[in-house]
């Protein structure tokens, strides 16, 4: 058993049929010694008396808010949560496996630049009685500070018969140099509590590996005389690290119709302009990627050919 | 806007081409190592990230773009000083900071070159003959060093009398390649920045 936060405790249980469970001793936070009784949740049934209560925690029915009282007055609470371990593996029932970039990916994180600011998100089908708490650091043995905000519900989607909820959090490394060469990864830890179930999820990464620039901005077309060709130009996204001559991007320019199966024109360039062949009912799209360290491509920025 | 340097016309900066080749060569070599040593811990997640130049050179700090010198997090250690006769910029007005930056890059390359050559000598003794260093990568390191043209004491190639542990050598190769790739990215960024100055 360990303390998650004040008056909230996590009991770690090996979860299998007829498991013996864990013996837990609760102590009432009071100077009083006599006349103390214990109850669980909203029940008025007295579970025991005295300053300490010993319980055998085996299942979710044994978890919950234990309260010690004296003469009708509440003295203190202890909330017990369960953390299940099945076949030596901690449960991951609360969050959905996003399977990208590999199986057992519950947290996904991205950074728009090298400033040390990043966003992580996760998915769940649970809509109520759900709380998250996020901590982060650079390295684990001698951790350096990363400050994370509160996790918020950022999107809701319908997936077949189920509703899916996306939560996200923004974090900022306290003293980040955009030009630094990372040798210690960022660690992100998410505590998830659904009703009386506790789970924790972690992700470890270098900012350089989660870079995904914003799409290029200000796409413009200039038709070339006596030709089917069009000159398309664009600018670096505002959120990208500066100076751009140091943090350079490379670009992919594509002309394609509405369907992915349609024919297309595609060219890669380090410049902020390119010449492509425009077709009726097609769109010109441009996306960006770090020129020197191949992490993710940005989303496409698009303009119609006409 | 940038470091106070006089440079020739854009595209005339001779080290840019070499640094692009360097990044390409080390990336290819790392990819080859990851494929060949698939049953060894050779991915970014599996290895310890060590920097053999730590406390010996300070390339990131010495080569910091002017715009980032206002960022206190980028200025934690700028105490290294090097020989200042680099030729990459083909200009007499090369600033002191610039020379410091280019000589730091030169020292990095020299240290990695020695490590790689020592390691290759060990790998050539491996009866499995599983992996060797790409001669192209070694050649590209050499070309960039020549383009930088700094005079510096020759570092003797380390020779080891004990029987090499090939497993450890291959893991060390992975660690070295990962670190060198990250340094090659920094070098490429620096050269691109100087070329645009």
């Amino acid at each position: 058993i360990w303390e998650l936060k004040k008056d909230v405790y996590v009991v770690e249980l090996d979860w299998y049929p007829d498991a013996p469970g864990e013996m837990v001793v609760l102590t009432c936070d009071t100077p009083e010694e006599d006349g103390i009784t214990w109850t669980l949740d909203q029940s008025s049934e007295v579970l025991g008396s005295g300053k300490t209560l010993t319980i055998q925690v085996k299942e979710f029915g044994d978890a919950g808010q234990y309260t010690c009282h004296k003469g009708g007055e509440v003295l203190s609470h202890s909330l017990l949560l369960l953390h299940k371990k099945e076949d030596g593996i901690w449960s991951t029932d609360i969050l959905k496996d996003q399977k990208e970039p590999k199986n057992k990916t519950f947290l996904r994180c991205e950074a728009k630049n090298y400033s040390g600011r990043f966003t992580c998100w996760w998915l769940t089908t649970i809509s109520t009685d759900l709380t998250f708490s996020v901590k982060s650091s650079r390295g684990s043995s001698d951790p350096q500070g990363v400050t994370c905000g509160a996790a918020t519900l950022s999107a809701e989607r319908v997936r077949g018969d189920n509703k899916e909820y996306e939560y996200s959090v923004e974090c900022q490394e306290d003293s980040a140099c955009p030009a630094a060469e990372e040798s210690l990864p960022i660690e992100v830890m998410v505590d998830a509590v659904h009703k009386l179930k506790y789970e924790n999820y972690t992700s470890s990464f270098f900012i350089r590996d989660i870079i995904k620039p914003d799409p290029p901005k200000n796409l413009q077309l200039k038709p070339l005389k006596n030709s089917r060709q069009v000159e398309v130009s664009w600018e670096y996204p505002d959120t990208w690290s500066t100076p751009h001559s140091y943090f350079s991007l490379t670009f992919c320019v594509q002309v394609q119709g509405k369907s992915k199966r349609e024919k297309k024109d595609r060219v890669f360039t380090d410049k902020t302009s390119a010449t492509v062949i425009c077709r009726k009912n097609a769109s010109i799209s441009v996306r960006a990627q770090d020129r020197y360290y191949s992490s993710s491509w940005s989303e496409w920025a698009s303009v119609p050919c006409s | 806007r940038n470091l106070p340097v006089a440079t020739p016309d854009p595209g005339m900066f001779p080290c840019l081409h070499h640094s692009q080749n360097l990044l390409r060569a080390v990336s290819n070599m790392l990819q080859k190592a990851r494929q060949t040593l698939e049953f060894y811990p050779c991915t970014s997640e599996e290895i310890d990230h060590e920097d053999i130049t730590k406390d010996k050179t300070s390339t990131v700090e010495a080569c910091l773009p002017l715009e980032l010198t206002k960022n206190e997090s980028c200025l934690n250690s700028r105490e290294t000083s090097f020989i200042t006769n680099g030729s990459c910029l083909a200009s007499r007005k090369t600033s002191f900071m610039m020379a410091l930056c280019l000589s730091s890059i030169y020292e990095d390359l020299k240290m990695y070159q020695v490590e790689f050559k020592t390691m290759n000598a060990k790998l050539l003794m491996d009866p499995k003959r599983q992996i060797f260093l790409d001669q192209n990568m070694l050649a590209v390191i050499d070309e960039l060093m020549q383009a930088l043209n700094f005079n510096s004491e020759t570092v003797p190639q380390k020779s080891s009398l004990e029987e090499p542990d090939f497993y450890k050598t291959k893991i060390k190769l992975c660690i070295l390649l990962h670190a060198f790739r990250i340094r090659a990215v920094t070098i490429d960024r620096v050269m691109s920045y100087l070329n645009a100055s």
């Epitope: 024919k263 297309k264 024109d265 595609r266 060219v267 890669f268 360039t269 380090d270 077709r279 | -």
Partner: antibody
Framework: QVQLVQSGAEVKKPGSSVKVSCKAS????????LHWVRQAPGQGQEWMGW????????EYAPKFQGRVTITADESTSTAYMELSSLRSEDTAVYYC???????????WGQGTLVTVSS | DIVMTQSPLSLPVTPGEPASISCRAS??????LHWYQQKPGQAPRLLIY???QSISGVPSRFSGSGSGTDFTLTISSLQPEDFATYYC?????????FGQGTKVEIK
């Protein structure tokens, strides 16, 4: 199985014209760009131009501009390349090639040898 | 026009040995570079597109690398059926242009 089948070899006099055909099978004809590339004996390839069979748009290499005409007939899934004012240096194997991507070629015809000789 | 220069023009190789062919562009072409194999009397066959992207059905011993002006096609271990002429082609701008070819011959 996508295939491009070209017309047979031709012998032409200098100053005349040649029209080579390229019939496509497998896949929808208008879903691909169609190019013509030639290869003179012992030489490398030379790109001549492309056509978008969907709308008849064409683009030609400046070297052949004014001498080459690329057309397409959607009803027969056939593309044509006509080269006029032939000279001896036009002796080459002419290939048609196609792809959904405009700028490179994933399927080629078997080639048509055009010999220009007086 | 962008000029593509291949080297060497002829490459004698022992079967089972690796081979590398270089292609240089007269100006930077990013990764807009494709590789073809051609055997005598046959049409070219696409091997690699956009410098390093492999084609399904092409053996994994063929790999491409490079960007900017310098590109390499590598055959990790030459098989008898790999003896052929190899061409690079740039698609950075029109007109599309090819290298003059590298003939890989049996040593």
């Amino acid at each position: 199985q996508v295939q491009l089948v070209q017309s047979g070899a031709e012998v032409k006099k200098p100053g005349s014209s040649v029209k080579v055909s390229c019939k496509a099978s497998g896949g929808t004809f208008s879903d691909y760009y169609l190019h013509w590339v030639r290869q003179a004996p012992g030489q490398g390839q030379e790109w001549m131009g492309w056509i978008d069979p969907e709308n008849g748009d064409t683009e030609y290499a400046p070297k052949f501009q004014g001498r080459v005409t690329i057309t397409a007939d959607e009803s027969t899934s056939t593309a044509y390349m006509e080269l006029s004012s032939l000279r001896s240096e036009d002796t080459a194997v002419y290939y048609c090639a196609r792809n959904k991507e405009l700028r490179y070629f994933d399927v080629w015809g078997q080639g048509t040898l055009v010999t220009v000789s007086s | 026009d962008i000029v593509m220069t291949q080297s060497p023009l002829s490459l004698p190789v022992t079967p089972g040995e690796p081979a590398s062919i270089s292609c240089r562009a007269s100006q930077s072409i990013s990764i807009n570079l494709h590789w073809y194999q051609q055997k005598p009397g046959q049409a070219p066959r696409l091997l690699i597109y956009f410098a390093s992207q492999s084609i399904s059905g092409v053996p994994s011993r063929f790999s491409g690398s490079g960007s900017g002006t310098d590109f390499t096609l590598t055959i990790s271990s030459l098989q008898p059926e790999d003896f052929a002429t190899y061409y690079c082609q740039q698609s950075n701008s029109f007109p599309l242009t090819f290298g003059q070819g590298t003939k890989v011959e049996i040593k």
